[in-house]
Interface confidence: low
């Protein structure tokens, strides 16, 4: 016990210290001595709960001794100095280092003073996100994969998407013992509307200052979706040319466009130019259904459009509207 009327010495240390797997960490531990108080420290001792013996000792004449000399080091304690700082550095942090440690000062006249510190071992995960290229399966499949590798504790993965779908998240042991690899798949029914859109994987971990966002651009392979534009139902006999356009969306891109009519090949006044069909002026009314057939690596699809070229109304000059 200290002499009556004097302030006691206090061992100061955080209740919990975080450290990263494989890195070094300092367990801070200081002896606070009130201004008028006198104390003499003869030993600093570190031990771990549940283990016999001490893991590190600093003796005022013998200096330091460690159970694992390559992994432990007193940060500030030196022979010939006042032993007020017992802070201990641990190198190459392992999962099994997590636990409760006791820092103890052997002092005179106050006796021994100690404090407990909980060492928490963290591992900062590596995060990757990748697209899972798919076709139109008609059933839910993974379209994106987000992997948070080697986190301790496990990372928390969520998805942000305007496309619908649902996550499928699983955990497996990480490469380093005690770490966890979290794999999250974003699963939906693929459609052409999904192709080229993005989903965002959000990874949260206590080692991050802020959540990590990884955007994945989705790829859905689908056959062409075809429509024909350029006709407004108001084409009249005239000298002007008009154009129909075959609008196709597909992934991969279209490899070919083929124009025909329901009657077979194109009439002389219609000239195919890739995705466009040039309609030359005609001198008599026509009523023709044009077909545009579009091909890509996954197949062929077509669209039809019936075009009427009429005689101009009596009240106004006749003319094919130019598009």
């Amino acid at each position: 016990w200290p002499p009556p009327g004097t302030g006691d010495i206090i061992v100061q240390a955080p209740t919990q210290v975080p450290g990263f797997l494989g890195d070094s960490v300092t367990l801070p531990c200081y002896l606070q001595v009130p201004g008028m108080e006198e104390t003499h420290v003869s030993q600093l001792t570190w031990s771990r709960h549940g283990e016999s013996g001490s893991m590190a000792v600093f003796h005022q004449t013998q200096g330091p001794n460690y159970s694992e000399p390559k992994r432990l080091e007193f940060v500030a304690a030196r022979l010939g100095t006042e032993l007020r700082d017992a802070s201990l550095r641990m190198f190459g942090l392992r999962v099994e280092d997590e636990g409760n440690y006791t820092c103890l000062f052997v002092t005179f006249p106050q006796g021994s003073r100690s404090v407990d510190i909980w060492l928490r071992v963290l591992a900062k995960p590596q995060n990757t996100a990748e697209v899972q290229k798919v076709q139109l399966t008609g059933k839910p499949v993974p379209v994106a994969r987000c992997v948070s590798t080697g986190g301790r504790p496990p990372a928390h993965i969520t998805w942000h998407s305007d496309l619908g779908g649902m996550p499928n998240t699983s955990q497996a042991p990480g490469f380093l013992s005690g770490t966890v690899t979290v794999t999250s798949l974003w699963i939906l029914v693929p459609s052409s509307q999904v192709d080229g859109k993005s989903v965002t994987c959000k990874v949260e971990h206590e080692s991050f200052e802020k959540p990590q966002l990884l955007t994945v651009n989705l790829t859905v392979y689908y056959p062409p979706e075809v429509s024909i534009s350029g006709y407004d139902n108001n084409w009249y006999l005239s000298q002007n040319e008009a154009t129909l356009t075959c609008d196709a969306r597909s992934n991969p891109e279209p490899t070919g466009y083929n124009w025909s009519t329901t009657m077979g090949p194109l009439p002389p006044f219609a000239v195919a130019q890739g995705a466009q069909l040039l309609i030359r002026p005609v001198d008599k009314p026509i009523n023709t259904t044009f077909i545009c057939n579009v091909t890509n690596a996954l197949g062929a699809r077509q669209a039809e459009l019936t075009v009427q070229v009429k005689e101009g109304p009596p009240s106004e000059p006749s003319g094919m509207s130019s598009n």
């Epitope: 797997l21 494989g22 590596q126 990757t128 992997v147 590798t149 699983s170 497996a172 042991p173 490469f175 380093l176 013992s177 690899t181 794999t183 798949l185």
Partner: antibody
Framework: EVQLVQSGSELKKPGASVKVSCKTS????????MHWVRQPHGKGLEWIGG????????SYNQRFKGRVTITVDKSTSTAYMELSSLRSEDTAVYYC?????????WGQGTLVTVSS | DIQMTQSPSAMSASVGDRVTITCKAS??????VAWYQQKPGQPPKALIY???YRYSGVPDRFSGSGSGTDFTLTISSLQAEDLAEYFC?????????FGQGTKLEIK
């Protein structure tokens, strides 16, 4: 394109050591764990061990502990597997394989023959 | 160590057949199972991860299922190029272990 290119075939005498290399390209070497797996002719696959290139932390199959050493050279993005005290039953094709939870990329394999 | 027991060890099937290979783990491995295809003279190629998800580029005739201790690889309609040996692997705990393989021959 991810590539794992291994060193050529080796013929060793019993008791000797062998060191097989695996040069990687097409990805960031320090972001993935590299493992070694072997396959005796006509038989199954056996995991030997692995290494995290960033920290050099290793994990070995206890069956090989004491005989195997896995190392990396970050400057050349190359992994190495050294097996000592070779015996005839170590004759096998040795593969390096990148780990992503499963082994997604493999080297072409290195045949190690142990014979007197 | 977790044992992965594959069956059958060898089988013969005709083009177009539905083929099923099973793998039984000696203890619960969740869904931490992968399947590999190894063609003669080549390294293994990953087909399935997390027990049931195909790698990009793997034909959809290949499918995986199962969790816990019982796992299945199915080829819905066998093709000539599927001639290979197939392996399962658990990555639930060290040491990682593989099944002994199933050699698939085409009739």
């Amino acid at each position: 394109e991810v590539q794992l290119v291994q060193s050529g075939s080796e013929l060793k005498k019993p008791g000797a050591s062998v060191k097989v290399s695996c040069k990687t390209s097409g990805y960031t070497f320090t972001e993935y764990t590299m493992h070694w797996v072997r396959q005796p002719h006509g038989k199954g696959l056996e995991w030997i061990g692995g290494i995290h290139p960033n920290q050099g932390e290793t994990s070995y199959n206890q069956r090989f502990k004491g005989r195997v050493t896995i190392t990396v050279d970050k400057s050349t993005s190359t992994a190495y597997m050294e097996l000592s005290s070779l015996r005839s039953e170590d004759t096998a094709v040795y593969y390096c394989a990148r780990w992503t939870g499963d082994f997604d990329y493999w080297g072409q394999g290195t045949l190690v023959t142990v014979s007197s | 160590d977790i044992q992965m027991t594959q069956s059958p060890s060898a089988m013969s099937a005709s083009v177009g057949d539905r083929v099923t290979i099973t793998c039984k783990a000696s203890q619960n491995v969740g869904t931490n199972v992968a399947w590999y295809q190894q063609k003669p003279g080549q390294p293994p190629k990953a087909l399935i991860y997390s027990a049931s998800y195909r790698y990009s580029g793997v034909p959809d005739r290949f499918s995986g299922s199962g969790s816990g201790t019982d796992f299945t690889l199915t080829i819905s309609s066998l093709q000539a190029e599927d001639l290979a040996e197939y392996f399962c692997q658990q990555y639930e705990s060290y040491p990682y272990t593989f099944g002994q393989g199933t050699k698939l021959e085409i009739k």
